[in-house]
Interface confidence: medium
């Protein structure tokens, strides 16, 4: 070896100065008597050094790098040869920083594996090889006084966490523990912990499970929910607080917390509950009365809410068959009494014989709101409720009896817009207590089976707004009947549209006669249409050659018309426009053309 | 001198209920663990609970979970166990114990006989 | 929860014999086993915890060994006031169950 390098430090701080020195040794035979020494750091020459010989021949060479900013590098003695960069020696040079202090220190109790785990935050980048260590020691009380040491746990190279299996931790006394971070500029100690490993326990949740229902148990009340969770077994021994969240899997509801509840329940019911609505529930326990971290939440359980009975009123109407008055078509709404008024699943119409005790026929049942069914000699009266698997709502009579009341007045209709019809009427005195309106198509479309109906309440309503079923260009019947305490008054009817529709299309014009001066044209009305409201006039248009145009207004009932005034031998444009208070509709244009003064009239 | 003195004991019906009490003294109870044993007639030692120093953990033996609670008062020295429900077979010599930092069963109390017969 | 079985259930020596009792865990339980020795109408008292720790006061002949699921409990010279009951406990988790015991009898 020619050269050898010699450096004040191969470590150092990022940014501090460094000093080298190489030799070269006189017996490098091959060499320049006064050899040139140069410096390479990495791949760059580096000026500045300090070139001497020595009294026993050896040539040195001293150079100081006022600031080390590379975090590695490799610093070269060499000389030239011939044409070429020869190096006598190298080192390598690194740089960084000292550790800074481990924080955020934590650890957590596994059960399962009865180990300690800890984790920590190493701080930034030193930039050189840095080696952590969790330190920890056997203690009484705070930790303050040192007992035994417990064996390091290194953890695995680039990872912040470390595992004290069970041999080595202390579950009936405290421990401290600290991470000691240590590399060749400095060691660094993280703030230490006391803890009694199960003061960090990490529970995990109880597994929630619904109640297997028992025969002589009774069944939950509406609203409510049976359930009951099993503690995890490895922390049974520990005192534990636990609470439940709830939500209704539908809609966006957020979590509502119920709680605190005791680690185990052999029952619980859980209640204030929607009805007939599916719930998720999942429940967590945390160490309690001493601190502790919160379990995961369990894993979901999925129950549904027993249901309540409907809570509904039945607003219901009836109607005979004319040809069979024993037959009647019953019809029925149910009207919310309250917000949550219970899932209907069907209707049942019942009737109860006078003089059999108990004995209630049915009639029918349905999940449709309406029935038809033959009505018994001597039924004047039967009972309509709404079901579910609950119960039932509050059984609704329904009489049938003459219509003895007096009859309403001045009915009458008009659109309001193309969706909506407005049915006004005088009350009639006394005043009924409500309005039956039904509603549907007119002829010839009519249909019993397919009619609306409303139920109005106040007997002093002069109106009603039709919105449900209302289409335009369609001819509606609608049929106002006043109620009374026990019986009702005779129906009244009316027929409007809610919007009509204009001519579809206008008659086709035909010519008749012509002459020089005039010609007669006639045509075949269109028939009139369901939902098209009646033509009011009719205008017949005709051009001639230099586009000038003329016009007659005719009455709705004309048949044909007579041009007069024309040009012999000129050529007309002519056109029929049908309209009615819906709008109007041209015909398609006519184009004929005048006899010559010579010719003779055409009949 | 450590110090452990049970009592509480006696004859009680099956069903019934008793409370033992340990009074302590001779070393600080409040930093260690503590723990009940008993011994049926002409039987093995029987490990029942024991309760951490600050008493947040409390594991019991399933012939006893349930029906027995551990409990502690750092303020008067005194460790107690709770049991309800007593049947034939916890007749025994109950044991009061101090517990070490391993876990061992340091030091113990005389025992105190309780007998559960109709 | 560990289960802990003691050999034998009772043994007959002399005085001056050497005797060995053992007690094998159900699963491994590192070195967190204890001996105690019990005399007719006495509470217990410990004598090695932690495996082969001896406690204060206790005389060098008993000693103990073993970790994991295997351990012994070793008296080497047999003395009058040894005749006793010895049981094993484990306190690696916090259900302590103890063996069954072994009865040393005089032969």
């Known amino acids: 070896e020619c050269g050898h390098i010699s450096v004040s430090a191969p470590i150092v701080h990022l940014g501090d100065p460094i000093t080298a020195s190489c030799i070269i040794k006189q017996n490098c035979s091959h060499l320049d008597p006064e050899p040139q020494i140069l410096w390479r750091l990495g791949a760059e020459l580096q000026p500045g050094g300090r070139q001497q010989r020595l009294s026993d021949g050896t040539q040195e060479s001293i150079i100081t790098l006022p600031h080390l900013n590379h975090t590695q590098a490799f610093l070269s003695c060499c000389l030239n040869w011939g044409n070429s960069l020869q190096i006598l020696d190298q080192v390598e040079l690194r740089a960084g920083y000292p550790p800074a202090i481990p924080h955020n220190l934590s650890c957590l109790m596994n059960l399962t594996t009865s180990s300690l785990i800890c984790q920590w935050e190493p701080g930034p980048e030193t930039h050189l090889p840095t080696s952590f260590t969790l330190k920890s020691f056997k203690s009484r009380g705070n930790c303050q006084t040192q007992g035994d040491s417990i064996l390091d746990c290194v953890p695995k190279d680039g990872q912040s966490h470390c595992c004290i299996p069970r041999k080595h931790l202390l579950l009936y006394q405290n421990m401290g523990i600290w991470v000691q971070a240590e590399n060749a500029l400095g060691t660094s100690m993280s703030p230490q912990l006391c803890l009694d490993p199960m003061d960090v326990v990490k529970l995990e949740p109880p597994m929630l499970r619904t109640m297997d229902p028992s025969p002589e148990a009774a069944p939950p009340q509406a609203g409510c929910l049976q359930l009951c969770w099993e503690p995890w077994q490895p922390g049974l021994h520990i005192n534990q607080k636990c609470e439940l969240r709830h939500k209704p899997q539908r809609g966006e509801a957020s979590w509502a917390l119920v709680g605190p509840l005791p680690l185990e329940a052999l029952q619980y019911e859980l209640c204030g509950l929607l009805p007939a609505t599916a719930y998720t529930l999942q429940i967590r326990c945390i160490r309690w009365p001493l601190p502790g971290h919160w379990s995961d939440w369990s894993p979901s359980l999925e129950l549904r809410t027993t249901e309540r009975a409907p809570t509904v009123r039945l607003d219901t109407w009836w109607r005979q068959r004319q040809l069979d008055p024993r037959t009647v078509q019953l019809f029925w709404k149910p009207v919310p009494l309250e917000e949550d008024s219970g899932r209907i699943q069907g209707y049942v119409v019942s009737w109860r014989p006078s003089g059999q005790a108990g004995a209630i026929l049915p009639l029918c049942n349905t999940t449709e709101l309406s029935c038809t069914f033959h009505l018994p000699s001597e039924a004047q009266e039967v009972a309509l409720v709404a079901y579910n698997s609950a119960g039932t709502s509050r059984p609704t009579p329904v009489v049938f009896s003459e219509s003895r009341g007096p009859a309403l007045t001045r009915l009458h209709a008009m659109a309001r817009d193309p969706h909506s019809l407005w049915v006004g009427w005088e009350p009639p005195n006394p005043w009924p207590q409500g309005y039956v309106i039904e509603w549907g198509l007119g002829p010839p479309s009519a249909s019993n089976s397919n009619k609306t109906w409303r139920m109005e309440q106040n007997g002093r309503a002069t109106g009603f707004l039709l919105k449900e079923n209302i289409r335009p260009f369609q001819l509606y019947e609608i049929i106002v009947t006043p109620l009374y305490q026990d019986t009702m008054g005779p129906s009244q009817h009316v027929y409007a549209y809610s919007q009509e529709m204009a001519p579809s299309h206008a008659p086709e014009l035909h010519l008749k006669h012509i002459g020089k001066t005039w010609a007669q044209l006639e045509w075949v009305p269109e028939p009139p249409e369901l939902g098209k409201s009646p033509l009011t006039h009719y205008t017949i248009f005709w051009t001639n050659a230099q586009n000038q145009s003329f016009s007659a207004i005719l009455n709705a009932s004309s048949r044909g018309f007579v041009l007069h005034g024309l040009e012999p031998a000129s050529l007309y444009h002519i056109h029929l426009m049908a309209a009615s208070q819906a709008g109007a509709t041209n015909s398609t244009v006519l184009t004929l053309m005048t006899l010559t003064p010579e010719g003779s009239e055409l009949h | 001198e450590v110090q452990l003195l049970e009592s509480g004991g006696g004859l009680v019906q099956p069903g019934g209920s008793l409370r033992l009490s340990c009074a302590a003294s001779?070393?600080?109870?409040?930093?260690?663990?503590m723990g009940w044993v008993r011994q049926a007639p002409g039987k093995g030692l029987e490990w029942v609970s024991s309760i951490s120093s600050s008493g947040g953990v409390t594991p019991y033996a399933d012939s006893v979970k349930g029906r027995f609670t551990i409990s502690r008062d750092n303020s008067k020295n005194t460790l107690y166990l709770q049991m309800n429900s007593l049947r034939a077979e916890d007749t025994a010599v109950y044991y009061c114990?101090?517990?070490?930092?391993?876990?061992?069963?340091?030091?113990w109390g005389q025992g105190t006989l309780v007998t559960v017969s109709s | 929860d560990i289960q802990m079985t003691q050999s034998p259930s009772s043994l007959s020596a002399s005085v001056g014999d050497r005797v060995t009792i053992t007690c094998r865990a159900s699963q491994g339980i590192s070195s967190y086993l204890n001996w105690y020795q019990q005399k007719p109408g006495k509470a217990p008292k410990l004598l090695i915890y932690y495996a082969s720790n001896l406690q204060n006061g206790v005389p060098s002949r008993f000693s103990g060994s073993g970790s994991g699921t295997d351990f012994t409990l070793t008296i080497s010279s047999l003395q009058p006031e040894d005749f006793a009951t010895y049981y094993c406990?484990?306190?690696?988790?916090?259900?302590?169950?103890f063996g069954g015991g072994t009865k040393v009898e005089i032969k």
């Open positions: 001779g070393f600080t109870f409040s930093l260690y663990w």
């Open positions: 114990a101090k517990l070490g930092e391993l876990g061992q069963y340091q030091f």
């Open positions: 406990q484990q306190s690696f988790q916090y259900a302590q169950h």
